[in-house]
């Protein structure tokens, strides 16, 4: 806490500018009006204040806004955001996606801090759900964001938001997360035609049940082996040789190279040898 001292003559700040970097902490406290600081927050980032000086500026804003900063100030916090605690952020009401982007930009390239996590949480709760534009923004800054949500958190993601998901956003998801995401993706893309639908749903198929794989096998999708290997073993096992052949199309020859690996290995063991022989790949059940 900085002591209350009178501002020296001629030092009263008329605007937030470079001259303030030469002010001692007590001078900043005494000579910078909090309301002036709030209206000129956008200038703070262009000035190389020390961490100690930023502490004073934060203190002034805290005094001016004890119930939490208004969004007009939050949007221009810049590096001062790094000084905020999760407790500070819980007082905020952030509704603008531009504000969220501005603050995420400050933390760009770093792991997710408790401050950023709290900010995102406040923002999403304020919107009522993790909508498409928000998810788009979050995965741009944090590609692993979606796969860092628990299955319970994912269950509240609306199907419409799935349009924002890129294949790489699912790279670190586990089977339980895909179990939740797949039905949402199926719903989101249901009005697309066969080939377009398959392109979009492909990344989510690790959560697909047998009946959906059977349906896909009737659509000439030519699933590649990399996708096939990520399918749930329990979903693949009931498929017939003919269904797998249709599902993979020209890629069916790749089964030979994967015959010792799941789910191919377990699937082979479930098939009649006569049926496997029709593939002409030398697969042994």
């Amino acid at each position: 806490e900085v002591e209350k001292t009178a501002c020296p003559s001629g030092k009263k700040a008329r605007e937030i500018d470079e001259s303030l970097i030469f002010y001692k902490k007590w001078e900043l406290e005494a000579c910078v009006d909090a309301a002036l600081l709030a209206t000129q927050m956008d200038r703070v980032n262009a000035i190389p204040f020390t961490y100690e000086q930023l502490d004073v500026l934060k203190h002034k804003l805290d005094e001016l806004y004890p119930q939490g900063y208004p969004e007009s100030v939050i949007q221009h916090l810049g590096y001062l955001f790094l000084k905020m605690s999760p407790e500070d952020i819980r007082k905020w009401n952030v509704t603008s996606l531009e504000t969220l982007k501005a603050l995420l930009e400050v933390n760009k390239g770093h792991e997710m801090s408790p401050q950023v996590a709290t900010l995102i949480d406040r923002f999403v709760k304020g919107r009522g759900q993790l909508d498409k534009d928000t998810l788009d923004t979050l995965t741009a800054f944090y590609p692993g964001y979606l796969c860092s949500l628990s299955p319970e958190e994912l269950s509240s993601v609306p199907p419409s938001s799935i349009w924002a998901v890129r294949p790489q956003d699912l790279d670190t998801c586990d089977p339980r997360q895909l179990d939740v995401l797949y039905p949402k993706a199926r719903l989101a893309f249901q009005n697309m035609n066969g080939s377009e639908y398959f392109v979009k749903i492909q990344s989510f198929l690790g959560g697909a049940p047998t009946e959906d794989l059977k349906a896909l096998s009737q659509q000439n999708v030519s699933m590649d082996l990399a996708t096939f290997m990520k399918l749930r073993t329990d979903a693949v096992l009931p498929l017939t040789v003919a269904e797998v052949q249709k599902l993979l199309g020209p890629h069916v020859e790749g089964l030979k190279a994967e015959e010792r690996h799941r789910p191919v290995r377990d699937w082979i063991l479930r098939q009649r040898q006569d049926d496997l022989d029709t593939l002409g790949l030398g697969l042994q059940g």
Partner: nanobody, 116 residues
Framework: QMQLVESGGGSVQAGGSLRLSCTVS????????LRWYRQALGKEREFISA???????SYSDSVKGRFTISRDNAKNTAYLQMNSLKSEDTAMYYC??????????WGQGTQVTVSS
């Protein structure tokens, strides 16, 4: 750079218990997810369990009801309590950590051998 170290593996009789630990260092992502996988000889790695940043847990069907995952955030450690072990649980057990950046980090693994 994140580092993961697993420990707690060993040999045990069928029906016995073991507790594996996975300690994470060099990483402070608030959205850290810790997962356990295992790989038996000649087979591929399979997902066993996960614990998410909100404390929610998930399990594969093969271990549900027998294994319990937990974490101590203060120690940056995840645990896998394995009860009623079976011979088919014999494998190398690996810890995997992923954060909001979308990069996966793996430990070196710890061997679990269950004899009947």
């Amino acid at each position: 750079q994140m580092q993961l170290v697993e420990s707690g593996g060993g040999s045990v009789q069928a029906g016995g218990s073991l507790r594996l630990s996975c300690t994470v260092s060099g990483y402070t992502d608030y959205r850290l997810v810790l997962r356990w996988y295992r790989q038996a000889l000649g087979k591929e790695r399979e997902f066993i369990s996960a614990i998410y940043s909100d404390g929610v847990t998930s399990y594969s069907d093969s271990v549900k009801g027998r294994f319990t995952i937990s974490r101590d955030n203060a120690k940056n450690t995840a645990y896998l309590q394995m009860n009623s072990l079976k011979s088919e649980d014999t494998a190398m057990y690996y810890c995997k950590a992923t954060g909001s950046g979308g990069v996966a980090y793996w430990g070196q693994g710890t061997q679990v051998t269950v004899s009947s």
